[in-house]
């Protein structure tokens, strides 16, 4: 009956931690005799390529300083402890403990047995390193350039992770990588660039960073800031101001980042009316007459500029009572 | 403590057998197989085969397969072997030898001098 | 069947040399060799298995090498007890096979 090494074919483990490469002689056959087992690396230099041995009287044997006996352990063989004990040996099961990049690579697990031979099975080790990761947004403003307006950054990841973003902005992405702090590891930044505009002001943006460590993509919302001037309308004309009308008012409705820091209230015509008193965003007008017969200019300031909006205004002799139009903009 | 203890020289003419013997001790005899070696001086080291008393299976090497027959009896730990149609060719120190890790323990050898 | 050639029949060294036994297989046999001292009148007692692991209560002076098909037994600082026979064996395949020896003198 063959017998047959049972290996898997790559086995991945976190970098610092522990891993196990699962190594087992199937079936059992009665008389087959497994004299030693041996595990090594067959692509490392030649004075490092044995890894470990185990011989059922001495036990296990770790000659080589990488990764070395501190690191190194069979899981479940066992030697001959007396003349009443066999060594069990079909578990070949190799532990690697304190993960190094150095590790990574194809280990061979054989087993000697009489009177079948040799047969070996190899693993891939790969290790792995698990990102953390972080996006924040970037305090911009305003202009007619790409600027960076979030980060997102993958730190110390192996293999370096992928990182994308969702968003309906129109937006380009540039990644730079950089070795990380630990050996063999990545860092990867992704900055969301974008002319910033207050259209960006406070839209959130998701980055999505993928790595084979982890069960499903992090989804890490960000939140744009964008400095912005000010973005006005005016707001409350309903093109039925009439001669001593006096439920009117006009607002002035503001998107800004950061918050106004003034409004100020003016006719193109140069000629305010007295009837019409400024109350910050507000312009509440007392009675209307035919000095409304103007175009209102609100004009609003912020630490990053100013903003304005005009709205053209008709005085009727009488109210319309067809029924209220549309409200001006 | 594992011991190997073997039978002594033998002296015999040509064509005629021989049977040796090979009495093992301070290990569970049935889970190892036991090994026979020859040595002619000047000639290195030949494995002949091995015999495994846990269920008397043996298997040999093919160039001493119509020389030697291996045999064991769990009974009292010992394992046989015989050498047939003996001829000067035979003339050798024969070991048994437990197979361990390597062959780990070793008789002290059995001398076959096979002359007219 | 696989050949081990030990092409050195006899070797000379003087106490406190270094010497090397060498062992050719005919084919590729990993790392599956080992390697037996022999001193006259005894039974062969293992040195080094797996190429390159020493056997327990073996002097460090005793170190094997190699893989594939060239393997090799060095003795650092030989001393008189080394004055000995040595050889090389595979266990890679059914038939076992051992080299034909190399007998280390001392001068």
């Known amino acids: 009956q063959d017998v047959r090494v049972q290996v898997l074919p790559e086995v991945r483990g976190q970098l610092g931690g522990t891993v196990e490469l699962p190594c087992h002689l199937l079936p059992p056959v009665p008389g087959l005799y497994i004299s030693l087992v041996t595990w090594q690396r067959p692509d490392a230099p030649a004075n490092h390529q044995n890894v470990a041995a185990f011989h059922p009287k001495m036990g296990p044997s770790f000659p080589s300083p990488k990764p070395g006996s501190e690191r190194l352990s069979f899981v479940s063989a066992k030697q001959s402890t007396g003349q009443d004990t066999e060594a069990e040996l079909q578990d070949a099961t190799l532990a690697l403990h304190g993960l190094t990049v150095e590790d990574e690579g194809n280990y061979t697990c054989e087993f000697a047995t009489f009177p079948k031979g040799s047969v070996r099975g190899m693993t891939w080790l790969r290790v792995i390193a698990k990102p953390k990761n972080q996006a924040e947004a970037q305090k911009v403003t305003f202009s007619q350039d790409p600027t960076t307006v979030a980060l997102c950054i993958s730190k110390e990841g192996r293999p370096p992770a992928r990182i994308s973003w969702l968003s309906s902005l129109d937006w380009e992405a540039k990644e730079t990588q950089v070795s990380g702090t630990l050996a063999g590891t990545v860092t990867v930044t992704s900055r969301f660039t974008l002319v910033p505009s207050g259209r960006a002001d406070g839209v959130t943006v998701t980055c999505k960073v993928e790595h084979e460590s982890f069960e499903e993509p992090a989804l890490i919302p960000v939140t744009l800031s964008v400095r912005y001037p000010p973005e006005v309308s005016i707001s409350g004309y309903d093109d039925n101001w009439y001669l001593g009308r006096t439920d009117a008012t006009l607002s002035c409705d503001v998107r800004s980042n950061p918050e106004p820091t003034g409004y100020d209230w003016s006719t193109t015509s140069g000629t305010f009316p007295t009837s019409a008193v400024a109350q910050g965003s507000q312009l509440v007008i007392h009675a209307v007459d035919s000095l409304f017969n103007t175009t209102f200019v609100c004009t609003v300031t912020n630490a990053v500029g100013m903003g304005r909006a005009e709205q053209v205004i008709f005085v009727r002799e009488t109210p319309n009572t067809a029924g209220a139009g549309a409200t001006g903009g | 403590e594992v011991q190997l203890q073997q039978s002594g020289t033998v002296l015999t003419r040509p064509g005629a057998s021989v049977k040796m013997s090979c009495k093992a001790s301070?290990?569970?005899?049935?889970?190892?197989?036991i090994h026979w070696v020859k040595q002619r001086p000047g000639q290195g080291l030949e494995w002949i085969g091995a015999?495994?008393?846990?269920?008397?299976?043996?298997n040999y090497n093919q160039k001493f397969k119509a020389k030697a027959k291996l045999t064991a009896v769990t009974s009292t730990s010992t394992a046989y072997m015989e050498l047939s149609s003996l001829t000067s060719e035979d003339s050798a120190v024969y070991y048994c030898t437990k197979l361990v890790g390597t062959f780990d323990y070793w008789g002290q050898g059995t001398t076959l001098t096979v002359s007219s | 069947d696989i050949v081990m050639t030990q092409s050195q029949k006899f070797m000379s060294s003087s106490i406190g040399d270094r010497v090397s036994v060498t062992c050719k297989a005919s084919?590729?046999?990993?790392?599956?060799v080992v390697w037996y001292q022999q001193r006259a009148g005894q039974s062969p007692k293992t040195l080094i298995y797996?190429?390159?692991y020493r056997y327990s209560g073996v002097p460090d002076r005793f170190t094997g090498s190699g893989s594939g098909t060239d393997f090799t037994l060095t003795i650092s600082n030989v001393q008189s007890e080394d004055l000995a026979e040595y050889f090389c064996q595979q266990y890679n395949t059914n038939p076992f096979t051992f080299g034909s020896g190399t007998k280390l003198e001392i001068k």
């Open positions: 301070g290990y569970i005899f049935t889970s190892y197989w």
């Open positions: 084919q590729n046999v990993g790392i599956n």
């Open positions: 015999v495994y008393p846990g269920n008397s299976d043996s």
């Open positions: 797996s190429a390159s």
